[in-house]
């Protein structure tokens, strides 16, 4: 029950996180004009990963896309890439985790398969969250660097435009959304990994079946490293999930034709 709850909660938390990463990536307010010296402004600038916008006090807002790829700073391209990788990994992780959910029955899927899928999705969520956090942090670092550049023709780090009047930019709402979303995805991924441990069968206990041989009394327990025979000792203690599987170097005993069940 606790495993199902952990897995379910991990899925929900990751889902919220990935939705947040998508929202942050699409948002225009990654950087906003610094209003510290002038809290009342007639023209307010803000920028996203894909376009820059200007909002006038008249209420008129104009947004312009960055219609160049080569002209954009490498850092911005890197942030875009990190966010997209985060979204793609997260989306795949969500897809995998849906099938891995304990509460959802799909054919005769083994618990071991669900455990593997849960682990896979968990790792994907962790990497997705880390990508988002890294992307947002790289952008934030870029802003901090540009903020303290006091030259009049400061390179904005956005559209490659030269500014005649220095407009300083500070952290926008998208950064905080990205950090929180990345964190949630990361937490969700960790929860999935924890749930995976509970899903994976530690051992397979089968009911012992007694075989009465004419010469010896043997309790034969197929599979598992706890199985032992009266003929020798199992020194390997290998863990076997499939009751029928055997390793070549294991000491095995087979009932003779005279034995009966």
């Amino acid at each position: 029950m606790a495993v199902t709850a952990c897995q379910g909660l991990g899925f929900v938390v990751s889902l919220i996180g990935i939705a947040g990463i998508i929202a942050a990536t699409c948002m225009d307010q990654w950087s906003t004009q610094d209003l510290y010296n002038n809290p009342v402004t007639a023209v307010f600038n803000y920028q996203g990963l894909w376009r820059s916008c200007v909002r006038e006090s008249s209420g008129f807002t104009e947004c312009r896309g960055y219609f160049t790829l080569l002209g954009l700073p490498a850092m911005l391209q890197a942030v875009r890439a990190l966010m997209i990788v985060g979204i793609v990994l997260g989306a795949i992780g969500l897809l995998v985790s849906i099938f891995a959910l304990k509460c959802i029955r799909i054919g005769s899927m083994e618990d071991s398969a669900k455990a593997n899928m849960t682990l896979t999705s968990g790792i994907m969520f962790i990497v997705s969250g880390l990508c988002a956090i890294a992307g947002v942090s790289v952008f934030a670092n870029m802003l901090v660097t540009n903020f303290w550049m006091s030259t009049a023709n400061m390179y904005t780090g956005m559209g490659g435009m030269v500014q005649t009047v220095q407009t300083r930019y500070t952290f926008g709402a998208a950064l905080f959304v990205g950090w929180v979303a990345g964190g949630l995805t990361l937490i969700g991924g960790v929860m999935m990994c924890i749930a995976c441990r509970g899903l994976a069968p530690e051992e397979t206990n089968y009911k012992a079946v007694s075989y009465h041989a004419s010469g010896h009394s043997v309790a034969y327990k197929p599979g598992g490293f706890k199985a032992s025979t009266g003929f020798g000792s199992n020194t390997k203690n290998k863990k076997i999930y499939d009751g029928g599987a055997r390793t070549e170097d294991e000491v095995q005993s087979y009932p003779s034709k005279h034995d009966y069940v």
Epitope: Q33, T41, A42, Q47, S58, G59, F60, M161
Partner: antibody, heavy 118, light 113 residues
Framework: QVQLQQPGPELVMPGASVKLSCKAS????????MHWVKQRPGQGLEWIGE????????NYNQNFRGRSTLTVDKSSSTAYMQLSSLTSGDSAVYYC???????????WGQGTSVTVSS | DIVMTQSPSSLTVTAGEKVTVGCKSS????????????LTWYQQKPGQPPKLLIY???TRESGVPDRFTGSGSGTDFTLTIRSVQAEDLAVYYC?????????FGSGTKLEIK
Amino acid sequence: QVQLQQPGPELVMPGASVKLSCKASGYTFTSYRMHWVKQRPGQGLEWIGEIDPSNSYTNYNQNFRGRSTLTVDKSSSTAYMQLSSLTSGDSAVYYCARLGRGNTLGYWGQGTSVTVSS
Amino acid sequence: DIVMTQSPSSLTVTAGEKVTVGCKSSQSLLNSGNQKNYLTWYQQKPGQPPKLLIYWASTRESGVPDRFTGSGSGTDFTLTIRSVQAEDLAVYYCQNGYSYPFTFGSGTKLEIK
């Protein structure tokens, strides 16, 4: 079409106060900020302040802060400007104007002439 | 506050002539975000309220004759009237729309001979 109606001239005593009105029509009143501009006889234009009718947010020119108060009545689509402690220097034509694209004053009222005299 | 300086304060021209009115701002009116200059030109005829002519330094308001053109960037701006007509008798004002408080130039009075 957009219209800003302002009343006729006002004659007031020094030290008194006056409340000027500006009735808007032809557009959604709450969608555009209303600005007030002062023009003394034979002089240039001086920006007094603005009010956002949607939330009554105001922004004043430092020279007018304290002596002028901007308000709106959404139900009647009317903007008001109250001027207090009037002096002869306040004798002027006061215009209301609607803010538009490019932070321009695209539509103006006819103006209300205020004369401060004893 | 941004100070707007207009020149000349007045000028007298003959109908059909080309007129240029200058406007200088104490700070740049160019916004880096959209590369637009927040400089507006108004025309005020005697006994009337001002009328919007040009915004964003060079964008003509609808209904304004094409003989009126605005140019300039940063701190220096010009209003040009290609072929002055008798009805252009007015005072022309430039206005800063880039930062509060909005400020106007002192005006240029255009008179026709």
